[in-house]
């Protein structure tokens, strides 16, 4: 079974580019990293740092989640990250997204031995 | 580089007191949620109390409720376990742990104190 780490990185990591290679990258990513498997996925964010620096976020600014959780942290510095956003015209199995590239700070829910992202919460 | 600091166990009588303390350094911002862990000799951890950074929410364990009491100085880093009416069944290494959930879960909280023994005689 897929651990809730490795499941983020699957979802979310994407240290390979420093940023979206093109208007088509969502589109091509969301398929490849199977998040258009069972149905469009809405709303995704990749995350272009290394793995390294993202898992340092759990040691970083401590703010509550969107859900109300309190193991959520907030990165000390802006990252490159990839927002795909379903598109109106995206229907099952033929998922469209639009892509936007941006640098933001990301919040991420940690949890575990070792504490690492197990979810990614939002970007501000 | 984050470091959180125990302080105040000891060896004590059953019926007895003790005082933990706490305090995190190397942080620059405030832990929402501060508790306290302990481990018995070949037991696994658990969860004894935790408290949010303004005061307002505690959990504790059913096992220590009416007999600890979790305390923080508000906003700050700091988190304290006042143990009193103590057992010889609350022997055990006492963690002090920072930036978890409120469900006293230790799989949420990432930071971690070395651990302080605390040791109730008969």
């Known amino acids: 079974k897929e651990t809730a780490a490795a499941k983020f990185e699957r979802q979310h990591m994407d240290s390979s580019t420093s940023a979206a290679s093109s208007s088509n990258y969502c589109n091509q990513m969301m398929k490849s990293r199977n998040l258009t498997k069972d149905r469009c996925k809405p709303v995704n964010t990749f995350v272009h740092e290394s793995l390294a620096d993202v898992q340092a976020v759990c040691s970083q600014k401590n703010v509550a989640c969107k859900n109300g959780q309190t193991n959520c942290y907030q990165s000390y510095s802006t990252m490159s990250i990839t927002d795909c956003r379903e598109t109106g015209s995206s229907k099952y199995p033929n998922c469209a997204y639009k892509t936007t590239q941006a640098n933001k700070h990301i919040i991420v829910a940690c949890e575990g031995n070792p504490y690492v992202p197990v979810h990614f919460d939002a970007s501000v | 580089q984050v470091q959180l600091v125990e302080s105040g166990g000891g060896l004590v009588q059953a019926g007895g007191s003790l005082r933990l303390s706490c305090a995190a350094s190397g942080y620059a911002y405030t832990y929402i949620y501060m508790g306290w862990f302990r481990q018995a000799p070949g037991k696994e951890r658990e969860g004894v109390a935790a408290?949010?950074?303004?005061?307002?929410?505690?959990l504790y364990a059913d096992s220590v409720k009416g007999r600890f009491t979790i305390s923080r100085d508000k906003g700050k880093n700091t988190v304290y376990l006042q143990m009193d009416s103590l057992k010889p069944e609350d022997t055990a290494t006492y963690y002090c742990?920072?930036?978890?959930?409120?469900?006293?879960?230790?799989?949420?909280?990432?930071?971690w104190g070395q651990g302080t023994q605390v040791t109730v005689s008969s």
């Open positions: 742990a920072a930036g978890g959930g409120y469900e006293l879960r230790d799989r949420t909280y990432g930071q």
């Open positions: 408290m949010d950074s303004g005061g307002g929410g505690t």
